[in-house]
């Protein structure tokens, strides 16, 4: 029997409770989104709550189950994929995570026409990647680093590549650095629009130095994980792109697509591939010194049976103030003439905007303009272009969806989302059906997320797909912190910040301040999104003020801010956090003796440097999986922003910007250093070197390692991590447990 005290006052205050750490760790207040799996202009698939795969037809309003949960369960399927001719479904099970995007799995093919699994010529296991052709039911898959093709699921496979070798040659899948820092996918193969051709990348890692670390497991001897991982300045993967005719794959075999001359003359990267038509493909290349990108449009020469990339179809994008693009070089969205395209790149004022390229980049027609940025082009149809930007009301941390009518002249612009649910929804993404007949809008906040379905012609809302009613009800008796997004103007720099305030915040009182920082190039922390997370709990229950600040190097506010950190990482990002803290102190409600900073990954680097800045502002801080020297991090990422660690390039700043160089300055702060020993991304080496430098300097500090955990510190480690950090902060701020 649980005795509850009777409510004396029926006031909201009494019925409400603060967030607990348990709420956060249990994911009690997590939200759902609804992204339709579009299969035509008016149909989509969705996995129902009871795990049936249901096909919805928007126009008829009908829905039916195409695959029962019973069939899914029979092979323990966690994912599925319908073939475009709707005759087969692949079922994915035995999911085994590798890196950020990559995983292996077992695949079963289910024949919808006879309700049976395809027997004979079954797929090998485990498969590294599998996908249907865009038309029909051809299958391409990667097994043991080689690519295979099936004309039909029951057919014997045709082996396309033969040189695949673990950690040496990767066909159709990226190696570690391409997966994490360039493609951001688990695959490196692309079907042409009608499935005639299959393009794929081959990565040769033969000469790349290997990172090796122990995986302790449960055995008597730990095993060693070896990953070809190019650190800054090291030998990089060698990439080649091939295309094979999938109708007659044995006829001429894979044909290599040439690299543009100005790219091939020195080390380079392949950055993306976009099919335009079945016989026209667009490849993007990038010099190793990443300020020059070349977009090359290549055509299939029937008479030659090869791919021709004329000089006239090479388009160069060059940055004179930083690196090419934002985080990545943007990809083109082709128009219906199959040669002109829309692309986001910096305009003359240094803001990323949509441009229309018909012949040369020099003659590009600017489609959007202003002191804000176009962020993503979702879809181009015959008469409309849909994109997202942060233009509305001049808040860089918002995302609204716009439609530009390109069929009429002059083109007219309409904000589709700006006034839909103005208070609740200021940060949107979208998902479009074929020909943009319909689209789903997914709103991430600042209110409770909501997903809705819309008519692509009229923009009319058709229905709510997910509104998180249960979450809304669950939060009714929770004292959530207050959030505000504002800006500071300092020395011609605008510093946007988000402040998370305790529920009963009183400006006349003094509160401990925690800075949460990421601060990496082209990142954005100050966003109008909903979140109930660890910092929400710290504000709600522990009475802390938490602030997030977007300083120099962050995105979507123009190139001046973005490229300010070019070739000098670890300087301005730290300065701007410090500047913001000083401004917060001036506001009068911060207890300046109780200020902390914490961050993860790049944020761990920034928090470490801030703690070691010698300002005396911070009492304590936490670095989770920090970078400690840019010489230890991946070439593709690091060199984009820092150049090469060579004497004639930028070695001096590589050396000056390490955490270790500032070991002495940690003497007067409480520092908690945390890292997973099996971090494939930011290697444990980084924290090992910080610890060594602190020991050598005889500086006391606290540390926690997580055995066999990667950069994400997932599972039970998450609970331990946040509990541990909470204790550390409460001790630092003299808060009772």
């Amino acid at each position: 029997i649980v005795l509850r005290p009777s409510r004396v006052h029926n006031s909201e205050e009494n019925t409400m409770r603060a967030l607990t750490l348990k709420d956060i760790l249990n994911g009690t207040f997590s939200y759902k989104t609804f992204f339709p799996n579009w299969i035509s202009g008016q149909e989509y698939l969705h996995q129902s709550a009871d795990n049936n795969i249901v096909l919805y037809n928007i126009e008829t309003g009908q829905s039916y189950t195409i695959l029962s949960n019973r069939t899914m369960k029979s092979v323990n399927a966690s994912n599925y994929g319908l073939s475009p001719d709707r005759q087969f479904v692949y079922l994915e099970s035995d999911y085994s995570k590798l890196w950020r995007y990559s995983y292996t799995a077992t695949y079963y093919i289910y024949d919808l026409s006879n309700g049976e699994f395809v027997r004979g010529n079954e797929l090998p296991r485990p498969i590294q990647y599998l996908c249907w052709s865009p038309v029909g039911s051809k299958l391409a898959y990667v097994y043991q680093n080689n690519i295979y093709l099936k004309q039909r699921p029951g057919d014997p496979p045709f082996q396309i590549t033969f040189n695949g070798r673990e950690n040496k040659i990767f066909n159709g899948i990226p190696d570690w650095v391409y997966e994490e820092e360039m493609l951001a996918t688990k695959y490196a193969l692309w079907w042409s629009p009608n499935g005639k051709f299959l393009a794929y990348a081959e990565f040769n890692d033969t000469d790349i130095p290997v990172i090796a670390y122990s995986y302790y497991g449960d055995e008597q001897y730990p095993r060693t994980i070896n990953i070809p991982y190019p650190k800054a300045g090291a030998k990089n993967p060698v990439v080649r792109i091939f295309i094979i005719d999938t109708t007659y794959p044995a006829y001429v075999g894979p044909q290599e697509v040439p690299v543009p001359a100005m790219i091939a003359s020195s080390d380079y990267y392949f950055s993306w591939l976009t099919w335009v038509t079945d016989e026209r493909v667009c490849l993007q290349w990038l010099k190793r010194v990443q300020n020059v990108s070349v977009l090359s449009i290549c055509d299939f020469r029937e008479d030659w049976q090869t791919w021709d990339c004329p000089k006239t179809q090479e388009h160069i994008e060059e940055s004179r103030t930083g690196w090419a693009g934002g985080f990545f070089v943007s990809t083109p969205v082709f128009s219906y003439d199959a040669i002109s395209y829309y692309k986001i790149f910096s305009d003359k004022d240094g803001y990323k905007h949509i441009h229309y390229i018909k012949d040369t980049v020099e003659n590009a027609i600017q489609i959007t303009s202003g002191k804000w940025e176009a962020i993503n082009i979702f879809r181009v149809t015959q008469d409309s272009l849909f994109y997202s930007s942060n233009e509305f009301e001049e808040y860089p941390g918002r995302r609204n969806i716009y439609r530009i009518s390109i069929g009429s002249y002059p083109p007219s612009k309409k904000c589709v989302t700006c006034h839909l649910r103005k208070e609740r929804c200021q940060y949107y993404t979208a998902s479009f059906s074929d020909y943009a007949k319909y689209y789903a809008l997914v709103c991430y906040g600042p209110g409770i997320p909501i997903s809705t379905l819309h008519d692509g012609r009229t923009d009319q809302e058709i229905k709510i797909l997910e509104e998180n009613k249960e979450l809304e009800n669950a939060l009714k008796n929770i004292q959530l912190p207050k959030e505000e997004i504002k800006k500071l103007e300092v020395d011609e720099i605008t510093l946007w910040y988000k402040m998370i305030l305790p529920p009963q915040f009183d400006r006349s009182k003094k509160y401990p301040l925690l800075i949460q920082v990421y601060g990496g190039p082209c990142s954005q922390s100050v966003r109008s999104v909903f979140a109930v997370n660890w910092i929400s709990y710290l504000a709600s229950k522990e009475g802390m003020v938490i602030a997030l600040v977007d300083g120099r190097g962050t995105a979507f506010q123009g190139d001046k801010l973005l490229y300010a950190v070019y070739r000098k990482l670890g300087v301005y990002e730290v300065e701007d956090q410090i500047t913001a803290v000083r401004k917060f102190i001036e506001m009068g409600f911060i207890d300046e003796k109780r200020i902390a900073i914490w961050g993860w990954s790049y944020g761990g680097y920034v928090s470490s440097l801030a703690l070691a800045s010698g300002t005396g502002l911070f009492k304590c801080g936490i670095a989770v999986a920090p970078v400690s020297s840019w010489e230890y991090y991946a070439s593709v990422y690091t060199e984009r922003f820092m150049g090469l660690p060579t004497k004639d390039d930028n070695l001096e700043h590589y050396k000056n910007s390490t955490v270790m160089a500032r070991a002495e300055y940690f003497r007067n702060v409480d520092y908690l250093l945390i890292h997973g020993t099996a971090d494939d991304n930011v290697h444990f080496q980084n924290s090992a070197q910080i610890a060594k430098a602190l020991v050598n300097a005889q500086v006391d500090f606290q540390a926690m390692w997580y055995s066999d955990q990667n950069h994400g510190l997932s599972g039970l480690s998450t609970n331990h991590l946040y509990t541990h950090m909470t204790h550390f902060l409460k001790q630092c701020f003299s808060l009772s447990d």
Epitope: P258, A261, W304, T306, P310, K311, T312, T360, V361
Partner: antibody, heavy 119, light 109 residues
Amino acid sequence: DVQLVESGGGVVRPGESLRLSCAASGFTFSSYDMGWVRQAPGEGLEWVSGIRVSGGSTYYADSVKGRFTISRDSSNNTLYLQMNSLRAEDTALYYCAKENDRHSFFEYWGLGTLVTVSS
Amino acid sequence: EIVLTQSPGTLSLSPGERATLSCRASQSVGYYLAWYQQKPGQAPRLLIYDASDRATAIPDRFSGSGSGTEFTLTISRLEPEDFAVYYCQQYYNNWPPLTFGGGTKVEIK
């Protein structure tokens, strides 16, 4: 009609410099990649250098790398070849040539200008 | 660097005869090969590009064939004005260095 007229050739001593010019007319100079090809007396053709429209990329044969510099001035439709540290083996008839817009073969050639390097 | 070898060095033929000139590449150049004609005291003139496409105003007695590493220029019936030196040039993927063959001299027998 496409016309390419080279000038600037002459007799120089080893180690000296020379600047060749090529005046182009009859086509949109700024839209085409250009190159220099040379022919030593009684010998075959040797590609020397090329310059791209896009990005202004420049390319050189190994035999002249670091000594020769190709450039262009689209305002007066002129291609240049700055030749420093000249050697006896640079003695040749130097042709200015217009590349095809799609591929790097030479559609039109000038009549050439003779460079003689002799002590 | 891709090396082009032309053969024969000299071809002695009479007007009206068929001339077959060969150009061999040290590695595959696909179809990226051009042929030029050069007469004494004159600049080279483009005859064939992309291995087999005739340039503007080139008579159809000139034809090119081949791909990869083996290429042929054929002059079906030699005219008096065809006696000259012929050069092949590769421009594989438009990559420098562009290279020329050593030339074949077609002379009157």
